[in-house]
Every structure is written in structure tokens, then in C-alpha cells.
């Protein structure tokens, strides 16, 4: 069997491999050692017994999308059946005091690989043996602690594979400089040690994307905006736009990034090198926001100008890279893949990212202020509680609801919240009466709201003991 027979549904073409050469990866036309690494089709009954106590699930994630030329990182995490975990030595053990369907286990080990590897023979003192090899026969790398790594991960994409020895979690990074743009498929097969051979325990696949557009996301924040995710904002208040560039491999770290904004309200173009910008819309309506991000990034060099034409045709100056079947190198001239040049690492290319949003601007409550507080006199005998009137003004649209949140002096522990509808005239002057239980200092958060906005003001007030001579004090506003 070949690797593509084991790892994929369909044999990838040489064309795919030639156009997507991954550094350090091998052609999936290579032979797979089926004696050491048995191959089970989906639905094979042997999968049921491939792991003690249930099935292992592999979760494959990536930091896709990747800007072409950057690195994309794939992570595989193994999820073991309930009550099982990997210990520091790489053995699989039962968690203490954890009960699964089989109850508590007397044996602490699910798989005690340490004991097995210490017993193993035929290693001629070097730790090298015919079974410490990957499916293509390459020996395991013998770095310190390699014996504690009991899982073999085979990654497969674009007609190529990469083998890795690891624990219950591994990461692999791939440079995308030679990868065709668009969605691609990564498949991973995981084997575990089993005596002097290996047993498949999980298979997983995931789509990743390589793009020549900088992946751009924009968050928008505006004070008093009731719902920041609905792309409806308020007139006459600044909106803060924050640009997030998805660049997990820091490919653009040394690039100068320019942000070109068009807010769609005839205020022209705004160019900045800062990833945040504030903009205030002064008219109601619907506006088309456009952002173009530009970065000079490492990239392919333009081809050299063609040499002057000789009088009779001669072979071109192009570099010829021979492309052979990995097992049977052919004679010179067999299936040449002509590349116009070897890419120069030092070239820069402008990369662009785009973001577009439609923003709706509406009237909203712009500001709220408490202009007066009055202690409402109560008839004797004095009750425990105090009634206080807050005289409130607002600017902008007319509120439909008022809420007061009364809390401790740190404004962290809420004592009570009261909301009520309000009917306010054009002047936006209203009185809010609230009850305070006992004397002391209180934090009062007062909000005025309508469908789209929510304006807040806060104050600390001191409610005195019920002595008529004690004035009500606004501690600070």
C-alpha cells in the first residue's frame, strides 16, 4: 500500500504535489508499512477494540485562514474516554476517584507503556530497533524522553505527508509560500503503541484556507450604544473602530501597515498607521463603511525580464526542477517541471485586506446628568427608609425607560435594581424617586434607555441618619 491508499479517499495527482511543495514533507506515493501499521477501513469491527474503555476522539484545529507565505499551525488533541488521562511518563492512567461505567479500576494503568519499553529487547543498546520507525520506515527521532511519546501522528495534505511522534497533544506548522490559494484539506491519522507494532485509534480531517488577502476583522464600540453587534449606532457620538489582523504566525510583524478608511458619509478618505480610529456620524441614515489594509510583506519576486531573443531558439534560462516518482528516479529529461526562477526570499509584495460594513445611524440618548437630589420628607414616626428624588436631564432622543441600580460604595455589590417606563417631554427633564433602606453611602447608577441607546450616569450619595438636621449629600458625581 501507498500512503495515499491509507490516508485519503482519492489518490492525489503529481500535479497537486508539484504545485504545493511543502518543506520537510514527503510524497504520498511512498510505501506504507502495513505490517507495523495496520490499516482499517471505516466500519471495521477492530476499531471497537482499538482502545481500552471506549473510543479516543482526535480534535484537529488550525489557526486558518493563513496569509500566503505565512505559517499555518495545526494542533491535534486526543480526548480519552471518561476517567482516563496521560501521566507525566506518557502512560495512560485512570484518574483517582473517578467512576465510569466499569466502576473504579483496581489497576491504575490503562496502558503502561513504560513497563513495556523497559522489557523490550533487540535494541542493540542504541534504542534503535526495527519497530521504532514511522510508517514509511524512517526511524523515530531519539531526543530526550522520546520513549514517553507513545502516539504516532501522520498528517496528510496536498499529496504529501508528515509523521510525528508525540504525546496526547501535538502541533505542526507548515509554511504556505508554495500552497495554492483557497480551501485545502488536512487529514490526520493517529496510531498508538501496541507491543512491537501500532494500532490506529483515531482519524480526523479539517479544512484550512490559504489566502492572499490579509484576514481583517473590525470591532466597533460606541458609548451609549445598546447593542454593539447590530451595526446600528448613534448620531453625534464617536464610534471607536478597532482593526484586528489575523496573523497568528506574526508574518506581518515587521511590515508597515496602512489603514485607509472611507466612512461613507462624504468625509473623504482617512489614512492612518494606527489600528484604532474614532469617527462621528452627524447625520442619520445608512452608510457604507470601507476599510482597506495594506502591508508590505515578504513575497515572490517578479520574474526577470526575458533575455534578448537569440537568432535561433535555445533552451531558456529557466531553472529546471526535475520531478520524479519518489521511488523510481527517471532519466534526465523525464517529466521536467520548468520553473521560471527560484523565488528570492528578500522580495516584498503589497498585501491587501478589505472590510466592508453597512452602518445605520439613528438618534439616541447622548448624555444623562443628575442635576439635583432632594430628600423627600416622610411623616413621623420616621420609617427606616429614606425617599430621594433625583432630577435628571438628558440630551439627544427621548428616553422610554429609566433604571436605577443601587449598590455598595464600591459600585460592585448590587443591592437592588428598579426599572420603570417613563414619559418625558421634549425638554427631557424628569424626576426619579427611589427608596434607600437605612443610612450610609450608596453608589447609584442611573440609566436612561430607548430602543437603540442606553446612557448612564453614576453618583455616590450619603444618606444620613433620620435626623432632620442632617442634609442629604451627593458624595461625588
Amino acid at each position: 500500500k501507498r500512503f495515499h491508499d491509507v490516508l485519503g479517499n482519492e489518490r492525489p495527482s503529481a500535479y497537486m504535489r508539484e504545485h504545493n511543495q511543502l518543506n520537510g514533507w514527503s510524497s504520498d506515493e511512498n510505501d506504507w508499512n502495513e505490517k507495523l501499521y495496520p490499516v482499517w477501513k471505516r466500519g471495521d469491527m477492530r476499531w471497537k477494540n482499538s482502545w481500552k474503555g471506549g473510543r479516543v476522539q482526535a480534535v484537529l484545529t488550525s489557526d486558518s485562514p493563513a496569509l500566503v507565505g505565512s505559517n499555518i499551525t495545526f494542533a491535534v488533541n486526543l480526548i480519552f474516554p471518561r476517567c482516563q488521562k496521560e501521566d507525566a511518563n506518557g502512560n495512560i492512567v485512570y484518574e483517582k476517584n473517578c467512576r465510569n461505567e466499569a466502576g473504579l479500576s483496581a489497576d491504575p494503568y490503562v496502558y503502561n507503556w513504560t513497563a513495556w519499553s523497559e522489557d523490550s529487547d533487540g535494541e542493540n543498546g542504541t534504542g534503535q530497533s526495527h519497530h521504532n520507525v514511522f510508517p514509511d520506515g524512517k526511524p523515530f527521532p531519539h531526543h530526550p524522553g522520546w520513549r514517553r511519546w507513545n502516539f504516532i501522528y501522520v498528517f496528510h495534505t496536498l499529496g504529501q505527508y508528515f509523521q510525528k511522534l508525540g504525546r496526547c497533544s501535538v502541533r505542526v506548522s507548515v509554511n504556505t509560500a508554495n500552497v495554492t490559494l483557497g480551501p485545502q484539506l488536512m487529514e490526520v491519522t493517529v496510531y498508538r503503541r501496541h507491543g512491537r507494532a501500532y494500532v490506529p485509534i483515531a482519524q480526523v480531517k479539517d479544512v484550512y484556507v490559504v489566502t492572499d488577502q490579509i484576514p481583517v476583522f473590525v470591532t466597533m464600540f460606541q458609548k451609549n450604544d445598546r447593542n454593539s453587534s447590530d451595526e446600528t449606532f448613534l448620531k453625534d457620538l464617536p464610534i471607536m473602530f478597532d482593526v484586528l489582523i489575523h496573523d497568528p504566525s506574526h508574518f506581518l510583524n515587521y511590515s508597515t501597515i496602512n489603514y485607509k478608511w472611507s466612512f461613507g458619509d462624504n468625509t473623504g478618505l482617512f489614512v492612518s498607521t494606527n489600528h484604532t480610529v474614532n469617527h462621528t456620524y452627524v447625520l442619520n441614515g445608512t452608510f457604507s463603511l470601507n476599510l482597506t489594509v495594506k502591508a508590505a510583506a515578504p513575497g515572490p519576486c517578479p520574474p526577470p525580464p526575458p533575455p534578448p531573443r537569440p537568432s535561433k531558439p535555445t533552451p531558456s534560462l529557466a531553472t529546471t526542477l526535475k520531478s520524479y516518482d519518489s521511488n523510481t528516479p527517471g532519466p534526465a529529461g523525464d517529466n521536467p517541471l520548468e520553473l521560471s526562477r527560484i523565488p528570492d526570499e528578500n522580495c516584498q509584495i503589497n498585501r491587501y485586506g478589505h472590510f466592508q460594513a453597512t452602518i445605520t445611524i439613528v438618534e439616541g440618548i447622548l448624555e444623562v446628568n443628575i442635576i439635583q437630589m432632594t430628600d423627600v420628607l416622610m411623616p413621623v414616626p420616621w420609617p427606616e427608609s429614606s425617599l430621594i428624588d433625583f432630577v435628571v436631564t438628558c440630551q439627544g432622543s427621548i428616553p422610554t425607560e429609566v433604571c436605577t441600580i443601587i449598590s455598595d460604595p464600591t459600585c460592585e455589590i448590587t443591592q437592588n435594581t428598579v426599572c420603570s417606563p417613563v414619559d418625558v417631554d421634549e425638554m427631557c427633564l424628569l424626576t426619579v424617586r427611589r427608596t434607600f433602606n437605612g443610612s450610609g453611602t450608596y453608589c447609584v447608577n442611573l440609566t436612561l434607555g430607548d430602543d437603540t441607546s442606553l446612557a448612564l450616569t453614576s453618583t455616590l450619595i450619603s444618606v444620613p441618619d433620620r435626623d432632620p438636621a442632617s442634609p442629604l449629600r451627593m458624595a461625588n458625581s
Partner: antibody
Framework: QVQLVQSGAEVKKPGASVKVSCKAS????????MHWVRQAPGQGLEWMGE????????NYAQKFQGRVTMTVDKSTSTVYMELSSLRSEDTAVYYC????????????WGQGTLVTVSS | DIVMTQSPDSLAVSLGERATINCKTS??????LAWYQQKPGQPPKLLIY???KRYTGVPDRFSGSGSGTDFTLTISSLQAEDVAVYYC?????????FGGGTKVEIK
């Protein structure tokens, strides 16, 4: 929708060069390799080569090596194929065709450009 | 280079009858083989890719089969509009190659 529009017919003398253009629209131009295929009158299809608009890498069929040059103008999403030292047997319809991702089959073709080489 | 041998060169079939075209490659290209239909004055039109996958919008009377080095295009019930030249193409490796073509006519 994807469209490949080629330049008009050309008549050339032997020994001259011809440059055929293929303007792409309806997709991300830099994401797909563009190929050139020719067809002599009453004959079959013959693959000439391909170019990657993203980095301008080219692969040419051995038969055309040294005579063909494929180039790209990203600003206009146009691919060019120049064939030099023309001979009468280069009389053919020249097609541009777009590959699909990592697969070299062609769902999209230009309308073709007839190049006639005659003294 | 991979050599493509298409047979027969021409084929006359009655309307509603089955037409079968063969394509043989000099080395294993499986499953990277495509089939095209070309009518006079038009560019080729993709019918089948990866040996057996019908391209979007292609009538289901067209089917592709085969593996390794032997592939077949079948038109299960020939219609008048199927009169054309049919080409196979290997998309396994560069240089890409086309078969010599099969002309399908109505008997």
C-alpha cells in the same frame, strides 16, 4: 460569473511573434493557474503551458520551451501568451483555460484566438 | 511524458443508443482523468473530471469510469445534441496531455 475573454484573430508572417491576451473576470484572479491550449485546424488539443498569476511561476511543455513566454498583468487581471519564431505549423486556435484549485482540469475556457501564420 | 491513446477515432451510433469511448494512458494516472466535448467553432466543454465525477450541469446520460490506465466515457442514450468530438485529458502530471479525440456521429 467566471469569464475569460481573449484578444482577436491575428495574421503573422513566419519568424514573427504573436502575443495573445486573456482577460479574466468573475473570480479572484490570483487564486488559479491559467493554462494555454492550442488546436491546429482539424487537429486535437495540445497543452502549451501554465502560469500562476499570484507569483508568475510558469511551467512550459518541452515542445514550446524557449519559444513561449507567459506573463501576467495583475492590475487588469490579464494573462498573455507570446509565441516567437512562428512557423506555418503554429497556425491554430489558441485557448486560455483556468484550472480549478489543485486540479488541472478546465471548466472555464476563453473563446479562442485564431493565429494564422502565412507568408 | 504520458502517452494518451483514444479509441475509436470515430463512432456512429443511432439516436437513443449507447456510445462508448475508450482512453488508455501509458502510465497509471488514476483517478486524474477528464473528458471534454467540443463542437465546431467552440471551446471544449468539461463533462467529467477525476475519472467519474460529472461536472455541474452535465446531463446524467454522460458517465465516466475506469482506473489505472484504462478509462471509458459512456453516453447511455445518444441525443442529437451530443454530436461532437470528445477528448480525454490526463490531469495527473505535467506536461498535461489530451487524447487524439473521438468524433461521434448519428448513424
Amino acid at each position: 460569473q467566471v469569464q475569460l475573454v481573449q484578444s482577436g484573430a491575428e495574421v503573422k508572417k513566419p519568424g514573427a511573434s504573436v502575443k495573445v491576451s486573456c482577460k479574466a473576470s468573475g473570480y479572484t484572479f490570483t487564486s488559479y493557474w491559467m493554462h494555454w491550449v492550442r488546436q491546429a485546424p482539424g487537429q486535437g488539443l495540445e497543452w502549451m503551458g501554465e502560469i500562476n498569476p499570484y507569483d508568475q511561476r510558469t511551467n512550459y511543455a518541452q515542445k514550446f520551451q524557449g519559444r513561449v513566454t507567459m506573463t501576467v498583468d495583475k492590475s487588469t487581471s490579464t494573462v498573455y501568451m507570446e509565441l516567437s519564431s512562428l512557423r506555418s505549423e503554429d497556425t491554430a486556435v489558441y485557448y486560455c483555460a483556468r484550472s480549478t484549485g489543485n486540479y488541472a482540469w478546465f471548466a472555464y475556457w476563453g473563446q479562442g484566438t485564431l493565429v494564422t501564420v502565412s507568408s | 511524458d504520458i502517452v494518451m491513446t483514444q479509441s475509436p477515432d470515430s463512432l456512429a451510433v443511432s439516436l437513443g443508443e449507447r456510445a462508448t469511448i475508450n482512453c488508455k494512458t501509458s502510465q497509471d494516472v488514476s483517478p486524474s482523468l477528464a473528458w471534454y466535448q467540443q463542437k465546431p467553432g467552440q471551446p471544449p466543454k468539461l463533462l467529467i473530471y477525476s475519472a467519474s465525477k460529472r461536472y455541474t450541469g452535465v446531463p446524467d446520460r454522460f458517465s465516466g469510469s475506469g482506473s489505472g490506465t484504462d478509462f471509458t466515457l459512456t453516453i447511455s442514450s445518444l441525443q442529437a445534441e451530443d454530436v461532437a468530438v470528445y477528448y480525454c485529458q490526463q490531469h495527473y502530471s505535467i506536461p498535461l496531455q489530451f487524447g487524439g479525440g473521438t468524433k461521434v456521429e448519428i448513424k
